[in-house]
């Protein structure tokens, strides 16, 4: 399977909400011995290997924000912890996988990574990730609502096995 990032750049005004999205593509094993671990984290731009560094999102680590379920099941974070920080990650039946950030601040700007780990019990793991940039802006030149920029077809399947 692969991870696609429909949008490579989100430009949002301070105070707005945004939902960053990744999508699982390709054949997904729905066997009983397969589960999917999905999560989000921040990383630094300009790394040799994108998303290799894991930084927290609003002080929450990738472990705090993870979803763990089988196949294309739906799931979302019910953690009070995440909600208290204005965050919610969710996954639907169609492989869409997102994190919603509420009340954006300038410090939310940066590179965001979604990570999907296919875990086969008693076997190997398969890891893929997608990356996108969030720019939070303020002042007269900031947009009044979030503006999203589609990934190029090459970028939208920007996967790196970890």
């Amino acid at each position: 399977f692969k991870v696609a990032t429909p949008y490579s750049l989100y430009v949002c005004p301070e105070g707005q909400n945004v939902t960053l999205t990744c999508r699982l593509l390709g054949p997904v094993d729905k066997g009983h011995d397969v589960t999917f671990y999905k999560t989000w984290y921040r990383s630094s731009r300009g790394e040799v290997q994108t998303c290799s560094e894991r930084r927290p999102i609003r002080n929450l680590t990738f472990q705090d924000l993870h979803l763990h379920h089988g196949g294309h099941q739906a799931a979302n974070t019910s953690h009070d912890l995440a909600q208290r920080h204005g965050l919610e990650s969710a996954s639907d039946h169609h492989g869409n996988f997102s994190i919603t950030m509420r009340n954006l601040t300038l410090l939310d700007s940066g590179l965001y990574c979604c990570l999907v780990v296919e875990i086969r019990h008693h076997h190997s793991e398969h890891r893929v990730h997608g990356a996108m940039e969030l720019q939070v802006q303020t002042g007269k030149d900031a947009p009044s609502n979030c503006v999203v920029y589609p990934s190029s077809s090459q970028d939208s399947e920007n996967i790196t096995a970890a």
Partner: antibody, heavy 116, light 110 residues
Amino acid sequence: QSLEESGGRLVTPGTPLTLTCTVSGIDLSDYAMGWVRQAPGKGLEYIAVISPIAYTYYAPWARGRFTISRASTTVDLKVTSPTTEDTATYFCARWAGTGWGYFNLWGPGTLVTVSS
Amino acid sequence: AFELTQTPSSVSEPVGGTVTIKCQASESVSNYLAWYQQKPGQPPKLLIYGASTLESGVPSRFSGSGSGTEFTLTISDLECADAATYYCQEYDPSIDSGSVFGGGTELVVK
């Protein structure tokens, strides 16, 4: 376009103090504004920034010790309970650009001395 | 805690010479780095932002380079007016501290 700080003076420890930055030729609804300080003979230290929609961003060490606020043509920094370590020149500065950033216009500074 | 280390703390160079000032971050700040010049009794003046972009009105004798954790400010064809203290500042929004200045480098031009 200019910035001018005022309110710096000699205060005793624990006496609250408010510094004011008066802006000329700048619309505060367009720019984030901040405060940076410099102890005598020392380096620069970021304190806080306030955005056009009045979101505030403090250095971790400054949270609870300072309060930044703004009006139409002024930006205030309240030193809630000064200690001798707060003796410094306090600069008001304007942020460049629309995102988290750096300062491209500075005031001349105002000196705060905390001593008993 | 995040740190931004400037070296050297002081440097002396002749008029017409070249000086290099280094700024090292304890973790990657991408290219979110600015350089300032400060003369005694004056506020800082922005020289460079984005690690290498020259602020309008700043002479091209000043240049910045680097990314990640290692950055350099180079001043060539030194003039007496360049005598000042130089500071780097990181402004990577993903660093918890928000924004941090380096300790400064004093430049003496002989």
